[in-house]
Amino acid sequence: FERTRSLQDPCSNCPAGTFCDNNRNQICSPCPPNSFSSAGGQRTCDICRQCKGVFRTRKECSSTSNAECDCTPGFHCLGAGCSMCEQDCKQGQELTKKGCKDCCFGTFNDQKRGICRPWTNCSLDGKSVLVNGTKERDVVCGPSPADLSPGASSVTPPAPAREPGHSPQ
């Protein structure tokens, strides 16, 4: 099949890093500077991504692969392939329309990126709060008070594994 296809379509012989040049009798021409083709048989080369401004070059563009960007210090990537850079906040904060704001009571963020998330509800697992939560840290759950009462067995069966039941915000 491949051989038949290549007889019918000379472009299928053009490897990655080249394009099938219609202006030159469908000869395989190298991709021009600042462009690439990551697969064979391409009729055009794609323009290389340029990492400008708050973006930093993580990997240079080559004739067969696009450039890859990350973010300058104080910023972090968002989305696939670092589509955007967003400013960092401190732990215990999240970025809002008005800049970095402290997490509301009952929520935390232990990173410089992302959003404030609700503290774990220990009682859903039949446990009690061992260490209170803060803006920067989730609560730590411990055995329920009943487990600690006199006469209670010191060996308690492990709580069933539970998927976090969060819904998108």
């Epitope: 696939a80 967003e86 990126r113 959003i115 969060h166 998108p168 915000q169």
Partner: nanobody, 115 residues
Framework: QVQLVESGGGLVQPGGSLRLSCAAS??????MFWYRQAPGKQREYVAH???????NYADSVTGRFTISRDNNKNTLYLQMNSLRAEDTAVYYC???????????WGQGTLVTVSS
């Protein structure tokens, strides 16, 4: 288990409008995105919206497309107006988790702009 399910794609004439939806479930999402991939082209960023309503758009769609999200319904939208032939693509919904460390993807919905 995270699920992102797009809908609303279809055939529309140049100058027309479409509204895409993406129903999300299974996690807290800090940021939700629309990307698109035209035939034979690289996937490209279209727009994003954060959980607290900050938005951003690619230059090619600014002023024509509007991204929004309904946090109660866990749904992301893309209102596309003044559509052009070059907007023809498969449109993908994507979402970053609460810590911006993982990106989840929908299966895509095809938008064709043609007379």
């Amino acid at each position: 288990q995270v699920q992102l399910v797009e809908s609303g794609g279809g055939l529309v004439q140049p100058g027309g409008s479409l509204r895409l939806s993406c129903a999300a479930s299974g996690d807290i999402f800090s940021i939700m995105f629309w990307y698109r991939q035209a035939p034979g082209k690289q996937r490209e960023y279209v727009a994003h919206i954060t959980s607290n309503g900050r938005t951003n758009y690619a230059d090619s769609v600014t002023g024509r497309f509007t991204i929004s999200r309904d946090n109660n319904k866990n749904t992301l939208y893309l209102q596309m107006n003044s559509l052009r032939a070059e907007d023809t693509a498969v449109y993908y919904c994507a979402a970053d988790d609460a810590t911006n460390t993982r990106t989840y993807w929908g299966q895509g919905t095809l938008v064709t702009v043609s007379s």
